[in-house]
Amino acid sequence: GELETSDVVTVVLGQDAKLPCFYRGDSGEQVGQVAWARVDAGEGAQELALLHSKYGLHVSPAYEGRVEQPPPPRNPLDGSVLLRNAVQADEGEYECRVSTFPAGSFQARLRLRVLVPPLPSLNPGPALEEGQGLTLAASCTAEGSPAPSVTWDTEVKGTTSSRSFKHSRSAAVTSEFHLVPSRSMNGQPLTCVVSHPGLLQDQRITHILHVSFLAEASVRGLEDQNLWHIGREGAMLKCLSEGQPPPSYNWTRLDGPLPSGVRVDGDTLGFPPLTTEHSGIYVCHVSNEFSSRDSQVTVDVLDPQEDSGKQVDLVSAS
């Protein structure tokens, strides 16, 4: 007869490991008992369990509650056992020793490999600001056994670097993603992808990029100066900018306080019916936590009577 087992049994942390040991004997042969022991190199054999044809399963105190026979139906020639709730410390060499009648004793070894799936973590780098050079956007760390693979999935252009730390029973891998921040990256996803044989599918952690910037400010509303005349209603100036974080707006008049009746509504400056009092230099001040910008315009409110008089004069002068 001969023993059938596996060279390597692979199990994920927390799962049950079936340690196979089947005696394929000749007709009439019987298995008296099967002794399981852990036999790591350099250490004495540590008994796990004894499977006796008459007495049943005896589990050694160190493994009490963790070793069981597979569920029925059971073949009397099958000396396989289940090691419940495998932990990392269970990884190692195991031996089954089968006592048979009349053929004698047989033994076989297998290696138990316990996969420890990683629990990845993503840590954003320092705040990203437009104008910076190559900057850390995020780092992703995953520890497992064997060492996990850490990669990045993104449309953003950047560079990656990885380093690994070996521990006694596992390895930690850290990958960093560096980029040159630009406003076009704002809101773009940066995804850390962790692969490992103990995972049914890759684990993904997504970080949304935030790049601080503030665009140049400009003022719209003075495109047609002829519209800015005495008595006109609904005249307004709008300050144009964009930024991250979203900026706040403030209006001032360079040559004095804002005239009465002028309404400030965020980026918009609303005027009552225009008078010559509204002529002046207006400043839009845009700011966020990253920067501030100013844009100024000159409003010249026209008096139609003056204008027509001038025209007459010009005509008459001609």
């Epitope: 004894l50 006796h52 008459k54 007495y55 049943g56 399963l57 005896h58 105190p61």
Partner: antibody, heavy 122, light 107 residues
Framework: EVQLVESGGGLVQPGGSLRLSCAAS????????MSWVRQAPGKGLEWVSR????????SYADSVKGRFTISRDNSKNTLYLQMNSLRAEDTAVYYC???????????????WGQGTLVTVSS | DIQMTQSPSSLSASVGDRVTITCRAS??????LAWYQQKPGKAPKLLIY???SLQSGVPSRFSGSGSGTDFTLTISSLQPEDFATYYC?????????FGQGTKVEIK
């Protein structure tokens, strides 16, 4: 036929000592682990101590640990129990018994001696 | 230590009766259980080993069953020489422990 014969029992004062012997005949004594089991008057059976065939790793009941010592002389086919610091509660019939297999668990006691009475009293 | 609880502690029966004694272990002991018979002034005698295997020379009217925590000794037809005290014993762990005994008396 295996025969086990105990001797050495008797009356002893509290704090005293006794040495029990168990002479085996009829089978290969050297191949079997041996145990001592006691039975107080009118009471049930209580395992006391065990020794393997090669005298390695003897084990004891908590109630006698540190006071009793089990040993064997395979050349004389004899099992011993040295009992020191005896107490009234050690009063019992002491049986020696043979274990069916030489291991530290999974043993039945298939042959027993007739017993020897130990009385601890002042 | 594993506690062994026998029931009943005593019973009265007549010759020819079927007698059942139970033994419960405080934790699983697979089939590491023996049954002994003891008559007054005599040493115990092994009847059943491995919960259900009949010791050589023991009459077939004795049988054992059970596994794990619950075990039974059955005497299919009680004979006059069967009036005695019966003990179960676990030997799954050290110390091996005995039940408190069941005394079978003549009704």
């Amino acid at each position: 036929e295996v025969q086990l014969v105990e001797s050495g029992g008797g009356l002893v004062q509290p704090g005293g000592s006794l040495r029990l012997s168990c002479a085996a005949s009829g089978d290969s004594f050297t191949s079997y682990a041996m145990s001592w089991v006691r039975q107080a008057p009118g009471k049930g059976l209580e395992w006391v101590s065990r020794i393997s065939a090669d005298s390695a790793s003897p084990s004891y009941a908590d109630s006698v640990k540190g006071r009793f010592t089990i040993s064997r002389d395979n050349s004389k086919n004899t099992l011993y129990l040295q009992m020191n610091s005896l107490r009234a509660e050690d009063t019992a019939v002491y049986y020696c018994a043979r274990q069916t297999e030489d291991r530290s668990y999974g043993y039945d006691l298939d042959y027993w001696g007739q017993g020897t009475l130990v009385t601890v009293s002042s | 230590d594993i506690q062994m609880t026998q029931s009943p502690s005593s019973l009265s029966a007549s010759v020819g009766d079927r007698v059942t004694i139970t033994c419960r272990a405080s934790q699983g002991i697979s089939s590491y259980l023996a049954w002994y018979q003891q008559k007054p002034g005599k040493a115990p005698k092994l009847l059943i080993y491995a919960a259900s295997s009949l010791q050589s020379g023991v009459p077939s009217r004795f049988s054992g069953s059970g596994s794990g925590t619950d075990f039974t000794l059955t005497i299919s037809s009680l004979q006059p020489e069967d009036f005695a005290t019966y003990y179960c014993q676990q030997h799954y762990t050290t110390p091996p422990t005995f039940g408190q005994g069941t005394k079978v008396e003549i009704k």
